[in-house]
Interface confidence: low
């Protein structure tokens, strides 16, 4: 594949990554799939600086990120280590709440209205953010 050196149209470049911010809502799995089809992944937040950047662009709206615990432990979709990595949960979160009555707990993480993170039911139709790194080998040519 080719090496991506600039961001696709309608994507925002920041610190050698490209970000795409949805304006509609999807369930977490559908959002994850959308990003993969764009040769990207749901956003992986690795620093307070990146957190502030994403927060600035999404505003006070529930928005999926690439963090889930559907198979047990919390995992970032790109393999970034969760335990040692950046975290920005709301104080009482994650709580894997079952009280919503929708079946199961809460296995997918999202940005809340104040930017801090919450775990929620993965089927909820939230906005999402895709991220792809510049200078990585892509399977497809850039979308120009």
């Amino acid at each position: 594949g080719s090496e991506r050196t600039c961001c696709p149209v309608n994507w925002v470049e920041h610190e050698r990554s490209c970000y795409w911010f949805s304006r509609s809502g999807k369930a977490w799995a559908d959002a994850d799939n959308y990003c993969r089809l764009e040769d990207a992944h749901l956003v992986v937040v690795t620093s307070w600086e990146e957190q502030k950047f994403v927060q600035h662009h999404i505003g006070p709206v529930n928005t999926w990120m690439g963090l889930h615990d559907q198979n047990g432990p919390w995992k970032w979709v790109d393999g970034t280590d969760y335990e040692t990595g950046f975290k920005n949960w709301r104080p009482e979160q994650p709580d894997d709440w079952y009280g919503h009555g929708l079946g199961g707990g809460e296995d997918c993480a999202h940005f809340t209205d104040d930017g801090r993170w919450n775990d929620d039911v993965c089927q909820r139709p939230y906005r999402w953010v895709c991220e792809t790194e510049l200078d990585k080998a892509s399977q497809e040519p850039p979308l120009l």
């Epitope: 709580d95 009280g99 809340t112």
Partner: antibody, heavy 114, light 107 residues
Amino acid sequence: EVQLLESGGGLVQPGGSLRLSCAASGFTFSSYDMSWVRQAPGKGLEWVSTISGSGGITYYADSVKGRFTISRDNSKKTLYLQMNSLRAEDTAVYFCARDRGSVWGQGTLVTVSS
Amino acid sequence: DIQMTQAPSSLSASVGDRVTITCRASQDISNHLVWFQQKPGKAPKSLIFAASSLQSGVPSQFSGSGSGTDFTLTISILQPEDFATYYCHQYNSYPFTFGPGTKVDFK
């Protein structure tokens, strides 16, 4: 400042109806589940109903199911409780609360009596 | 439905005392428990959420512990403004339920 302000309480006859409102300010209303909790005079707290942030999911206590309807207007940042077929045992102060009780209104008194 | 019980139902204490209130759920509720304080004629106020996390702005003499079915609220050094009724509340599953309350009054 984060605030909830209830209104709409009053005296109503058994079998009558009343609609309570809860006006929210100081936070992104649509991001939070909202609940109604009531407290009969001299008694403890009783959960009544909860509605999801979008308004798409609602839950009710068995004691009010089929008689009360919770709703919200996110554009007006307002929560509602429509109470029909009121009974004497519905007499209470009704509080609206955000999320899991992190913010409460001051309450509004509903008295059901002939 | 999940039943919540509290002990004691009331207690008399003095300023400076250490006060402990227990709450028991009829089934496992993980850490999905809140403690509220209520004074006469006022709305409840959240003290502790997720069983052990202190609500913002609440003084540090309040602490919570427990998980599963057994929970404790501790006031390490009772202050004059702490005389009130305390309720536990489970939000693990609907219908949400409250404990019957514990009234803390002057000895």
